[in-house]
Amino acid sequence: IVLRPSRVHNSEENTMRALTLKDILNGTFSYKTFFPNWISGQEYLHQSADNNIVLYNIETGQSYTILSNRTMKSVNASNYGLSPDRQFVYLESDYSKLWRYSYTATYYIYDLSNGEFVRGNELPRPIQYLCWSPVGSKLAYVYQNNIYLKQRPGDPPFQITFNGRENKIFNGIPDWVYEEEMLATKYALWWSPNGKFLAYAEFNDTDIPVIAYSYYGDEQYPRTINIPYPKAGAKNPVVRIFIIDTTYPAYVGPQEVPVPAMIASSDYYFSWLTWVTDERVCLQWLKRVQNVSVLSICDFREDWQTWDCPKTQEHIEESRTGWAGGFFVSTPVFSYDAISYYKIFSDKDGYKHIHYIKDTVENAIQITSGKWEAINIFRVTQDSLFYSSNEFEEYPGRRNIYRISIGSYPPSKKCVTCHLRKERCQYYTASFSDYAKYYALVCYGPGIPISTLHDGRTDQEIKILEENKELENALKNIQLPKEEIKKLEVDEITLWYKMILPPQFDRSKKYPLLIQVYGGPCSQSVRSVFAVNWISYLASKEGMVIALVDGRGTAFQGDKLLYAVYRKLGVYEVEDQITAVRKFIEMGFIDEKRIAIWGWSYGGYVSSLALASGTGLFKCGIAVAPVSSWEYYASVYTERFMGLPTKDDNLEHYKNSTVMARAEYFRNVDYLLIHGTADDNVHFQNSAQIAKALVNAQVDFQAMWYSDQNHGLSGLSTNHLYTHMTHFLKQCFSLSD
């Protein structure tokens, strides 16, 4: 059980106040983290509170400003990047968001040696992506879907690609679906370790169907936004990978890296690229039917000036029970011999664990094992491997950092974080300097987040980087809800849940219950993290009990739970929320006439299906930007879990799992449907179709749209959204305003 310290003493009780909705909307109780921008084994950069860029040397204890806030302000810079040779800094301004990760910006290059901006051969604007080479100060950038190279910031650019075209050919940047569902980055180019080669992806979207929606803006006529967006079963982007020698880019030009034969035989994806050395690269490919992944290690042939990918260096990863990998196929972390690597994939018992691959995947040596999962490999050095897992005390929603000594035999394992601040910190991530000389630990909770700096050899804490003292003080007179994380055992399924309880919770009383659900494949909602958010307010001020439940399809508890939803989305996720609600009612403190469910995105889909389940459990519910039919969502995501919407594959379940098919069942619930009209991700089409089905079934419901808002419903829309949802729930639960 994770109980937040209530800090309520009788004498103080009258000075304590509940959270308000205003607190939440103003971000009054938001926390800070500190991620060092490592530039060597013992140095990092950090942007100070007054916006100076400061270089810290851990070993000398010295720090100095490398770039003043005055210089930053002179171009309205919101971000920066130091060249590895420390001669130049790029300054980023005019940030303009595109999709989840992508944005365009204006870039200025500042010469640290003379304290002036580089003049002559300035960068064009706006730039879609820009980065320094890993060594020296070469620049690669993407402008109007083409890649350019500069040997030095003041040099004229060398144009690498010429076929880039808006919405047609993307070079060095992903198209919509690769950005959102495969790469999870704004870039698709990768420098080799010493900057000799530059690898990049080319995405051809010529044949992809386009989603078009109106952007109303302020003009007389709305604009139409067109995005090549492959929905389930549609034509996909065609991807090719090229590598160019950046020392002599004009000599042989870009060389294409071959796709493995077993991948090239049908539709496929490129999933990631990892440089091993300057002359060895590792590419990962995935069949369109995403249960087969191939990792291909390719070598530069000096005599041929091309990349050779022998069959002996192809490693196949196949899932027979679901899709390959977790949310994504994991990426390899290469060891110092530059051919063997460490990788997370399912072991024979169906738990994701670290394996060491020396020759073939079949002969992989399992490094971690148990009924828990390894989650991320942070760093491999000559003698240590650092990773995170949820092993400690068998709580799937925790993250601790471990070190395995790979230099000794047998390897020994040490939990670096388990006992550091045991009550406060149970969910960590880490950031390592070169050669893991030092590292930062960032603790996200369940207590107030704290970031600390550590010695990479001894694990000794060197200093606190950020401890959120102001937040701690601000919370001293706030009646925070209590939180507990427990599990239910139902029919051989373990359902972990987090319950958020009103500050003066009394088990003998009855409380309204709100289920907050996401429930998407490979997600996890029940996590030991700190948050003061809307549901904290609902518990603190409005006296609701809020519960989050991780059912079938969720992550980090083994493949049996994860792959249970394979090819049948919308069934078990809903069942498990319902099962949990019934168990909560049995606990005796839930008013069974006042139960609601809400969710966003995938959670909106699950909440809609739960409301339409015909159980009579839910009085009301909210769906924000829900998927309503898997035929409307992106191919890469949807097909991973559902296969293809064709007769000979899984069309029947695509049809059976829509929200529209259950329109009649909304008759006895209060339903609030919300969507942004400019949602590039889950298209407004989804909610439009739900609304149409409800109207056709003559079922009353409430709805709210947010004009020109995307999937995030940000800015003023956020305030309106949470205010509107609060009114809806209070009305549903008969709570006075």
Partner: antibody
Framework: DVQLVESGGGVVRPGESLTLSCAAS????????MGWVRQAPGEGLEWVSG????????YYAESVKGRFTISRESSKNTLYLQMNSLRAEDTAVYYC????????????WGLGTLVTVSS | EIVLTQSPGTLSLSPGERATLSCRAS??????LAWYQQKPGQAPRLLIY???NRAIDIPDRFSGSGSGTEFTLTISRLEPEDFAVYYC???????????FGGGTKVEIK
């Protein structure tokens, strides 16, 4: 020493079936990609089918797709080619061949077995 | 599929002479080309792989060259046992279908 010995050839009528076998020795059979290549009387070489050692992926020439099936039994160090719906144009000497481990050229060949399809 | 065209169809030469055989690909195959020798009643034998590398036990009078679409097999001094049919084969990216050229017959003049 690497050895590949084909068997199972013979005379059949159009539409009938035949299974060719290839007994392999002198190398770790399960690790290598294998293939069948045929040669019609007086003609050149034609690649027919291939199978991966790891992963077991199978590949076919368009002319035999849907009629021929390549398979392997690693415990017996044997490669097979199941040929259904045979046609007169399938008449040829069928060679079993071992691919190089790095790339798909044929390092070692069997002596071949003759398949005659005639009414 | 990639088509390989060998020329000439037949090459009539005397022992001791130099033989130059050509293989042209319909599209670039990089360096992924092999040469085989086949004598009557025998199985083919690998001579050259990766366009220019000699296979094990192949005498150094056999050499291969070329890349992309144009390849050459050269026999510097023909020995009596070299009179046979020679085939080229592409294995570009190891993608099926693997294809062979139509063959060049080297016969005694």
């Amino acid at each position: 020493d690497v050895q590949l010995v084909e068997s199972g050839g013979g005379v059949v009528r159009p539409g009938e079936s035949l299974t060719l076998s290839c007994a392999a020795s002198g190398f770790t059979f399960s690790s290598y990609d294998m293939g069948w290549v045929r040669q019609a009387p007086g003609e050149g070489l034609e690649w027919v089918s291939g199978i991966r050692g790891r992963g077991g992926s199978t590949y076919y020439a368009e002319s035999v797709k849907g009629r021929f099936t390549i398979s392997r039994e690693s415990s017996k160090n044997t490669l097979y080619l199941q040929m259904n719906s045979l046609r007169a144009e399938d008449t040829a000497v069928y060679y079993c061949a071992k691919e190089n481990e790095r790339h798909s050229f044929f390092e070692y060949w069997g002596l071949g077995t003759l398949v005659t399809v005639s009414s | 599929e990639i088509v390989l065209t060998q020329s000439p169809g037949t090459l009539s030469l005397s022992p001791g002479e130099r033989a130059t055989l050509s293989c042209r690909a319909s599209q670039s195959v990089g360096h992924y080309l092999a040469w085989y020798q086949q004598k009557p009643g025998q199985a083919p034998r690998l001579l050259i792989y990766d366009a220019s590398n000699r296979a094990i036990d192949i005498p150094d009078r056999f050499s291969g060259s070329g890349s992309g679409t144009e390849f050459t097999l050269t026999i510097s001094r023909l020995e009596p046992e070299d009179f046979a049919v020679y085939y080229c084969q592409q294995y570009y990216n190891d993608w099926p279908p693997l294809t062979f050229g139509g063959g060049t017959k080297v016969e005694i003049k």
